[in-house]
């Protein structure tokens, strides 16, 4: 089953996908599409790359903000709406017989959560949890965990009814390794 990523309406969603070019710099075509990966290509393509660069994008909201030339083809969807919810396919079209890497990831877009305390704290939180909120400017690899954060009691409405999170610092650290398992 797909790994779920959750973003708030109006924020940016980050859907991870990567490969290791072999040899380095030897890029392969990648497509991102809405809908599970079919037997070839992607359905409802939103972005496509070739051996050199992004060469097809259906909207200016879709970006590859990672190091594309090192194989980071994670998709950023800017300013998400509820209509962006659904399964997305990242297909890496690797040379060879039946070698394509296919990754299905599920984006769930929710209405803005009621968060206490400051929004900046919520922003770090949402960047760090794969089955929680994944909005923000940067992907999980770039998320910085502050050296010390107070324990907080955070309530997020519209998300599993109510989610109580304590000892935020440890939670963030623990989740950092798992978010990339798309």
């Amino acid at each position: 089953s797909e790994v779920e990523y959750i973003a708030e309406v109006g924020q940016n969603a980050y859907l991870p996908c990567s490969y290791t070019p072999a040899p380095p710099g030897n890029l392969v075509p990648v497509c991102w599409g809405k809908g599970a990966c079919p037997v070839f290509d992607c359905s409802n393509v939103v972005l496509r790359t070739d051996n050199r660069d992004v060469n097809d994008r259906t909207s200016g909201r879709y970006w590859l903000k990672g190091d594309f030339h090192k194989g980071d083809v994670s998709l950023t969807i800017e300013n998400v709406t509820l209509a962006d919810s659904g399964v997305y396919c990242c297909r890496i079209q690797i040379p060879g017989i039946m070698n394509d890497e296919k990754h299905n990831v599920k984006l769930v877009v929710i209405k803005p959560a009621k968060v206490t305390p400051a929004p900046t704290l919520q922003r770090d939180l949402t960047s760090a949890f794969p089955r929680m909120l994944t909005t923000g400017e940067h992907g999980p690899a770039e998320t910085q965990t502050p050296g010390s954060l107070p324990d907080v009691n955070l309530t997020v409405s519209n998300f599993f009814c109510e989610l109580q999170i304590f000892t935020l610092t440890n939670e963030l650290r623990d989740s950092g390794a798992t978010i990339r398992t798309a």
Epitope: V39, S43, R48, D50
Partner: antibody, heavy 120, light 107 residues
Framework: QVQLQESGPGLVKPSQTLSLTCTVS??????????WSWIRQHPGKGLEWIGY???????YYNPSLKSRVTISVDTSKNQFYLKLSSVTAADTAVYYC????????????WGQGTLVTVSS | EIVLTQSPATLSLSPGERATLSCRAS??????LAWYQQKPGQAPRLLIY???NRATGIPARFSGSGSGTDFTLTISSLEPEDFAVYYC?????????FGQGTKVEIK
């Protein structure tokens, strides 16, 4: 507009290798957005997808034929190829090369097909 | 592999009539179903892809619907050139498979 033309022997002996060439004109085989495919149709029957090759070198074969089939490409000649080894009478069919265009609105281009008969 | 079953095997209609062709998959193919038209001595031609999208250059009288396991191709008003064999094809799971075809013939 992309045009495709199959060529190759119309008669192959059992146990030999069937070899077909598809020549592409009106488009580059090395450009993205096209899946270069082989499909066959047994006489009076339905269609069977043999496999495809993408410009990246990504290749997919029908598992029922995988051990016997090879699809390759020569970008300098703008051609792609089908080889099917150890043929039997069951491989007698019309063989089509086709290109499925997937950028924008999907479309397709087909050769006219070539009948290959396997017989001694 | 996924088996596609088309019905009816033959459909006898007159020009101007509405044709409704059915395709049922042995397991869900989501919306990854295409329809092809084939005339005698010719290669197939893609009509509909992803269940309901018309391919390049296909007239509006052809429409597709359905998802999961049950799909329909509708030709709203048959033209003389529409009498042919129609195949459904799935691209949800490898290998892509075709139905056995429905022949639309002149009544």
């Amino acid at each position: 507009q992309v045009q495709l033309q199959e060529s190759g022997p119309g008669l192959v002996k059992p146990s030999q290798t069937l070899s077909l060439t598809c020549t592409v004109s009106g488009g580059s085989i090395s450009s993205g957005g096209y899946y270069w495919s082989w499909i066959r149709q047994h006489p009076g029957k339905g269609l069977e997808w043999i496999g495809y090759i993408y410009y990246s070198g990504s290749i997919y074969y029908n598992p029922s034929l995988k051990s016997r089939v090879t699809i390759s490409v020569d970008t300098s000649k703008n051609q792609f190829y089908l080889k099917l080894s150890s043929v039997t009478a069951a491989d007698t069919a019309v063989y089509y090369c086709a290109s499925l265009m997937v950028w924008g609105v999907m479309g397709d281009y087909w050769g006219q097909g070539t009948l290959v008969t396997v017989s001694s | 592999e996924i088996v596609l079953t088309q019905s009816p095997a033959t459909l006898s209609l007159s020009p101007g009539e509405r044709a409704t062709l059915s395709c049922r998959a042995s397991q869900s193919v989501s919306s990854y179903l295409a329809w092809y038209q084939q005339k005698p001595g010719q290669a197939p031609r893609l009509l509909i892809y992803d269940a309901s999208n018309r391919a390049t250059g296909i007239p509006a009288r052809f429409s597709g619907s359905g998802s999961g396991t049950d799909f329909t191709l509708t030709i709203s008003s048959l033209e003389p050139e529409d009498f042919a064999v129609y195949y459904c094809q799935q691209r949800s799971d490898w290998p892509p498979t075709f139905g056995q075809g429905t022949k639309v013939e002149i009544k």
